[in-house]
Interface confidence: medium
Amino acid sequence: KSPIFGPQEVSSIEGDSVSITCYYPDTSVNRHTRKYWCRQGASGMCTTLISSNGYLSKEYSGRANLINFPENNTFVINIEQLTQDDTGSYKCGLGTSNRGLSFDVSLEVSQVPELPSDTHVYTKDIGRNVTIECPFKRENAPSKKSLCKKTNQSCELVIDSTEKVNPSYIGRAKLFMKGTDLTVFYVNISHLTHNDAGLYICQAGEGPSADKKNVDLQVLAPEPELLYKDLRSSVTFECDLGREVANEAKYLCRMNKETCDVIINTLGKRDPDFEGRILITPKDDNGRFSVLITGLRKEDAGHYQCGAHSSGLPQEGWPIQTWQLFVNEESTIPNRRSVVKGVTGGSVAIACPYNPKESSSLKYWCRWEGDGNGHCPVLVGTQAQVQEEYEGRLALFDQPGNGTYTVILNQLTTEDAGFYWCLTNGDSRWRTTIELQVAEATREPNLEVTPQNATAVLGETFTVSCHYPCKFYSQEKYWCKWSNKGCHILPSHDEGARQSSVSCDQSSQLVSMTLNPVSKEDEGWYWCGVKQGQTYGETTAIYIAVEERTRGSSHVNPTDANARAKVALEEEVVDSSISEKENKAIPNPGPFANEREIQNVGDQAQENRASGDAGSADGQSRSSSSKHHHHHH
């Protein structure tokens, strides 16, 4: 018995191609010896058609090749443009002559079945249903009605009017008549699969007087839509499955060797690899939904499928849509840190990239929530006021034109840990995702404000000082007044930074802010921070309450950053030292926005109708600087 193995019978159709794999034992000699494909003649002779030595017969010219796969111990014969003349007996084998080790293969090429001229062709997508119309003469009205599927030898019953149903069609096939019309019956087959494709015959009556109709059912697999996306960008899969599955659970899965692994579904299942960077959004009552994935990685490339089924899992015979996603590694989106680390009580400055060609676009920052289908409520934006629970500790600084805006979050708690998205109402590919990790603080903060319980008295002078370590010496220090539209930087002269010295006294490094005289509008949150050019660093926040001289009660009411600011900033510095940018968060691209509750995955943030101007990041505010007195000691 030959150790070569292959298919004993191969059946195909005229015009098609076929790939025949032959297996050989794993030896070095076998891997290197000649492989051949020959056709057996009546005399028993086997005429070589193609071999691994480069021989190619005239009848195979331009339509066949033979490829050896020594690592698999297989070789493959590919033959294209098959004709009925290719029907016959062949051998695939190894050896210098065609009498070597071989395996017999029978190839049968059939004609494309010629459909009878009265054949009705139905073309349907996989998962949909078809209603086949079967007309008959009145005299066959009392007779049995049936639909059968043609095989090579016979016609296999699908369903008949005596309620007989083929096991493959149970629950999917219905035979019925409409109204009082006794000249036509219908067969509905639902949840169509590839295997339902083929030729059917519907029949009413028996024998020569029977009415017959030929039906060709073609079941089409959806052509995958090709999607080309950049590394670190985002992709939206828009899935439109139709009204009939509007009430079913929806899913997106990725094709694996033998299954389709669910990435997300509307029943709350989510692949951990996509944590923090995926949302699924039901669009309407017509079975439309979309899935957004941000922060695309190289390994996200592949074949995706969306579908609907009550289980939230892929199911044969249910409608699907498919995509082939390619991830281009030469990305225009900058490579930023995807994880930012902060400590409790501290702050993080997150640099969000956006398309530099769209500097006037609205910028947003939202927090990804994994519950339900996932959503991303906007926390702050250039025209979106800061959410109440982030009062005094969150601001967005837009730096026009340089392709980056900064989001600063201070007074961190462990509850701030999670995933956040940077997004704009412009180029949706630039949605980026950042994971914020917050650890318990183990040392004093770098920036410290005194006094800590700040209550200013109306009409008097009030000074707060911000102490900073020597490592921030060469960085620009600033105070800003926070409002829910941003943190308005208060003008200052940074004269201390221009002084030269040889030592740094840790205790004397401070930048002070003086309110003189204190007015009611001065009440609110103030931040002390450091930055280098447009790169923001650490911040710390303090709430200044304003009271009457009588020391009456005060209420918290953060005011507009553009109110009269009567500020003196003083800085005592005695050294230049190496600048250290701590907690400089540089995110890795991820996802998206719209409305306060960003649930319409593909929709852009221009729908965010929250009003108000963004706080200025560079002192170009509307406040009058003539009211500011700068005291430098």
Epitope: V10, D16, V18, S19, I20, N72, E258, Q315, E316
Partner: nanobody, 126 residues
Framework: EVQLVESGGRLVQAGGSLRLSCAAS????????MGWFRQAPGKEREFVAT??????????YRAEDVKGRFTISSGAAKTTVWLDMDALNPEDTAVYYC?????????????????WGQGTLVTVSS
């Protein structure tokens, strides 16, 4: 999830015939392989026969020692596969398993098949 249900196994006299049937549900693609393996008491599971559909072509594979006696065929819907066994002998006694898989490369390797039935017992008495 793909499910395979075998039937048809029973006690048969040597020289007799038997038809095993395997019905599949959940096969979501048009290209797959579906066939039969058997395992005799105390022996390894061995390949019997397989049908493979790939890009419009159909491939039939059979083990050398069953050629001429066993025939594998399928229903029109490709979801049922039959194994017709003639000239049975006591060495054919085994549990016969139906197997299916997508992208099956090495048809004789059990590890290439992802889905298996529970098995049906065929006993051939002398």
């Amino acid at each position: 999830e793909v499910q395979l249900v075998e039937s048809g196994g029973r006690l048969v006299q040597a020289g007799g015939s038997l038809r095993l049937s395997c019905a599949a549900s959940g096969l979501t693609r048009s290209d797959y392989a579906m066939g039969w393996f058997r395992q005799a008491p105390g022996k390894e599971r061995e390949f019997v026969a397989t049908l493979k559909w790939s890009e419009g072509s159909r491939f039939m594979y059979r083990a050398e020692d069953v050629k001429g006696r066993f025939t594998i065929s399928s229903g029109a819907a490709k979801t049922t596969v039959w194994l017709d066994m003639d000239a049975l002998n006591p060495e054919d006694t085994a549990v016969y398993y139906c197997a299916a898989g997508f992208n099956v490369g090495f048809v004789r390797r059990a590890s290439e098949y992802n889905f298996w039935g529970q098995g049906t017992l065929v006993t051939v008495s002398s």
